[in-house]
């Protein structure tokens, strides 16, 4: 059962796993949620009746029954982890804590103009977990405006104390705001020879990389595969760090793989969700339960629905035994990973999917697409919406993309002459315009947010957000697309598609069925040559065939230029402008979304 509210003046008795320090009960709840075993917590707020050394303690707790006895205690705030909840979870914490000093290892000290600048510095520093900033009112002159970057083994402060005229806060890496490079490559036959901060068992290098990503101290990793010569080290995932933030030495070693934490691209890549099955593989760990199940998929479902289950091993039924049902072993461990991984015993293993809700919804795999053909099929582009105006009559106005459960990203030029958001209707999950009837459900638009530097499409800033009146329930036919990572600026996208209901030639009409076209990206230098009368800025991105023939056209505006990278679709561009449609040597010009990620996050995460 999902319980989100906090219990004031209440303490949970027993079940302690560990104690950490957090600046608020709200953040204690987040820490508990992300901890592999924590189900409940008790936080101690500052209070004259409490010993100051206990202020800001966050005791993480577990219980076989998923609850613990409650005791009245002033200044104690207790609650449950969000593991039991189905809603999306984020570790992003933008709060600034006034008059609190969050203790950790102070590894960098510099002058900053403001707390915001200090927080940005922390976000863009590979080691930084949190910071403390001494304001200009700080009593000690030489410490004024000093920004201290800090880290700890756990990613949370080692202690928190009251200190006048300072502010503290956390890195915003988990808010997708880091400019650090996002290196997705996994290097085969490579060992990074740096200090290990931890080691866990993993079935493959991808899981190892994801574990590294959400481990607070891990910057890169080395994984020894099951063919590694030293038996005791097989399936070992070594989590590593270095002072420089990069591996100091790379050693060529067969059957080892290495890679980097995906911390700065984690909002657009799954890092918690280990959805694969591992055949002929047994995961060892503390046994939670043994239940009969028809298949390994059914076993995974059972594990996902059991809040304490972290991973499982399924042994298929022997012949006609037990009505064809196999045994499903639900398991857990102290760190969420198997204590040992064995091969060749016939088991099928995997992980709970409960943690998938900690990943961005946009990273969910969508159904395989139909290659070739220009008409799309249902569910092929589930982020694509059709934006209708009701003036003068109801009609398709522009395309748009779902980027959040209340947010559509589209082009600013779509709103020329639109005096009110009330006259707009957003339809999602639509393949054919003819499906839209008077009684078809739609999302009303609460607010149109146009970039304040927008003047006309050709001069850039052709980007707008629509805030919907109600939230979108994600399904197979309507779900968000990931924004590109700022760390992905140098990625060369090779699988890009433009979609929309727009014209198929310059003098045409809106198409009934959603059209798709695979279009190659064109460098900005090349694009500039084709548009000598315009300035093609780095905030624009171009796509098109030299010979023309495939392009976006009237009515496609605002829709997505979607590019697939590492199995995840990213919203690389917004259809903006071009000379004619599909003309030779006249590529389509799109708003370069990666350059507006900060703007998008600022507007969509505004309180």
């Amino acid at each position: 059962e999902c319980v989100t509210q906090l219990l004031k003046d209440t303490c949970f008795e027993g079940g302690d796993i560990t104690t950490v320090f957090t600046p608020s009960a709200k953040y204690c709840q987040v820490v508990c949620t992300y901890h592999p075993r924590c189900l409940l917590f008790t936080f101690t707020a500052e209070s004259p009746s409490e010993d100051p050394t206990r202020w800001f303690t966050c005791v993480l707790k577990d219980s076989v029954t998923e609850t613990l006895p409650r005791v009245n205690r002033t200044a104690a705030i207790s609650g449950y982890s969000f593991k039991q909840c189905s809603h999306q979870i984020s570790a992003c914490n933008k709060d600034i804590y006034v008059d609190l000093d969050m203790k950790g290892i102070n590894y960098n000290s510099s002058v900053a103009k403001s707390a915001q600048e200090c927080q940005e510095r922390c976000t863009d520093d590979v080691h930084c977990h949190f910071f403390t900033y001494a304001t200009r009112q700080f009593p000690s002159l030489e410490h004024r405006n000093i920004c201290l970057l800090k880290h700890t083994q756990t990613g949370t402060p080692t202690r928190i104390t009251k200190l006048d005229k300072v502010v503290s806060g956390f890195s915003l890496k988990s808010c997708a705001l880091s400019n650090l490079a996002c290196i997705r490559d996994i290097f085969p036959n490579t060992v990074f020879a740096d200090s290990n901060i931890d080691s866990v068992m993993a079935p493959d290098a991808f899981v190892c990389g994801r574990i590294c990503t959400h481990h607070p101290g891990c910057l890169f990793f080395t994984f020894f595969s099951q063919e590694w010569p030293k038996e005791s080290q097989r399936n070992l995932c070594l989590l590593k760090t270095s002072e420089s933030g990069l591996p100091s030495t790379r050693i060529k070693k067969s059957k080892a793989l290495s890679g980097f934490s995906l911390q700065s691209c984690r909002h657009s890549i799954p890092v918690f969700c280990h959805s694969s099955f591992y055949h002929d593989t047994d995961f060892l760990g503390e046994e939670l339960d043994i239940v009969a199940a028809k298949s390994h998929e059914a076993c995974q479902k059972l594990c996902t629905n059991a809040v304490r289950c972290q991973f499982f091993t399924y042994t298929p039924a022997q012949a006609s035994c037990n009505e064809g049902k196999g045994k499903c072993y639900l398991k857990l461990s102290s760190n969420g990973s198997p204590t040992k991984i064995l091969h060749g015993r016939g088991g099928i293993s995997g992980y709970t999917l409960r943690l998938c809700k900690m990943d961005n919804e946009c990273t969910t795999k969508i159904k395989p697409r139909i290659v070739g053909g220009t008409a799309s099929v249902r569910g092929e582009w589930p982020w694509q919406v059709t934006l209708h105006t009701t003036s003068p009559t109801q009609r398709h106005l522009c395309g748009g993309s779902i980027i959040g459960n209340q947010w559509i990203l589209t082009a600013a030029h779509c709103f020329y002459g639109v005096e009110s958001p009330k006259i707009l209707r957003v339809y999602s999950g639509i393949l054919n315009q003819s499906e839209i009837k008077e009684d078809t459900s739609f999302f009303g638009v609460q607010e149109i947010i146009i970039h304040d530097q927008y003047k006309m499409a050709e001069s850039g800033y052709d980007i707008a957000l629509l805030k919907l009146e109600t939230t979108v329930n994600y399904t197979d036919s309507q779900r968000p697309i990931c924004l590109p990572s700022k760390g992905d600026r140098n990625v060369i996208y090779t699988d890009c598609w433009v979609t929309g209901w727009g014209y198929r030639k310059l003098r045409d009409k809106i198409q009934n069925t959603l059209q798709k076209a695979k279009i190659p990206l064109v460098t900005n230098e090349e694009c500039q040559k084709r548009y000598r009368g315009h300035k093609i800025t780095h905030k624009m991105i171009c796509a098109g065939y030299r010979e023309g023939g495939k392009d976006a056209c009237k009515g496609d505006s605002g829709g997505p230029l979607s590019c697939k990278h590492n199995e995840v679709w990213h919203l690389v561009g917004i259809t903006s402008w071009g000379e004619g449609c599909a003309q030779r040597e006249r590529p389509g010009v799109y708003t370069n979304v990666v350059e507006y990620v900060d703007w998008i996050l600022e507007k969509t995460q505004a309180v």
Epitope: T390, S391, P392, R395, S420, P421, I423, K437, E438, K509
Partner: antibody
Framework: QVQLQQPGSELVRPGASVKLSCKAS????????MHWVKQRHGQGLEWIGN????????NYDEKFRTKATLTADTSSSTAYMHLSSLTSEDSAVYYC??????????WGQGTSVTVSS | NIVMTQSPKSMSMSVGERVTLSCKAS??????VSWFQHKPEQSPKLLIY???NRYTGVPDRFTGSGSATDFTLTISSVQAEDLADYHC?????????FGAGTKLELK
């Protein structure tokens, strides 16, 4: 069922003004544009303008911009058209009509305005 | 403003005959054209929307066709109750405009 009720007739003096009403029922008044159309005796239909009751957004034909003012009262689901400085040229039947999903699907019975001294 | 020109201004028909009314737009209005039937002392009634879609309850002898600038309303077999004025109107862009109408009379 959708209904648009208009008073049958209005007799007004030249130079005066009149406020025509159109009471809507049977649908969500705020979610549809209400249009006003003029028909002089023996002539065609002329579009005056429209209003979106949920936001009070309006559009007018330039010809009627200084003549007509459109308003809506969402509490009573009534649309109004105020006509000012009336002359004999304004003598006509005035219809309110709902812009349905794709067209003007429901029409009021029309109010006959006679401008005479 | 988009001008909608209807022809003929009037026509006399016998019951059972096929009638074709024309409406031309001064510029491309895609398919944003409606046809209305208007009888004396009544309010106009919607027959066709989107150039070719028959409105609910309209007999299937009424058919609309055309796109861009040329539109047609066809009555396959005219009935006595079809005697009325017929107006086309465009809702592609503001200001909305109507044709002057075609009067359909009985011979």
């Amino acid at each position: 069922q959708v209904q648009l009720q208009q008073p049958g007739s209005e007799l007004v003096r030249p130079g005066a003004s009149v406020k025509l009403s159109c009471k809507a029922s049977g649908y969500t008044f705020t979610r549809y544009w209400m249009h006003w159309v003029k028909q002089r005796h023996g002539q065609g239909l002329e579009w005056i303008g429209n209003i979106y009751p949920d936001s009070d957004s309006t559009n007018y034909d330039e010809k009627f911009r200084t003549k007509a003012t459109l308003t809506a009262d969402t509490s009573s689901s009534t649309a109004y058209m105020h006509l000012s400085s009336l002359t004999s040229e304004d003598s006509a039947v005035y219809y309110c009509t709902r812009m349905g999903f794709y067209a003007m699907d429901y029409w009021g019975q029309g109010t006959s305005v006679t401008v005479s001294s | 403003n988009i001008v909608m020109t209807q022809s003929p201004k009037s026509m006399s028909m016998s019951v059972g005959e096929r009638v074709t009314l024309s409406c031309k737009a001064s510029e491309n209005v895609v398919t944003y054209v409606s046809w209305f039937q208007h009888k004396p002392e009544q309010s106009p009634k919607l027959l066709i929307y989107g150039a070719s879609n028959r409105y609910t309850g309209v007999p299937d002898r009424f058919t609309g066709s055309g796109s861009a600038t040329d539109f047609t309303l066809t009555i396959s077999s005219v009935q006595a109750e079809d005697l009325a004025d017929y107006h086309c109107g465009q809702s592609y862009s503001y200001p909305l405009t109507f044709g002057a109408g075609t009067k359909l009379e009985l011979k």
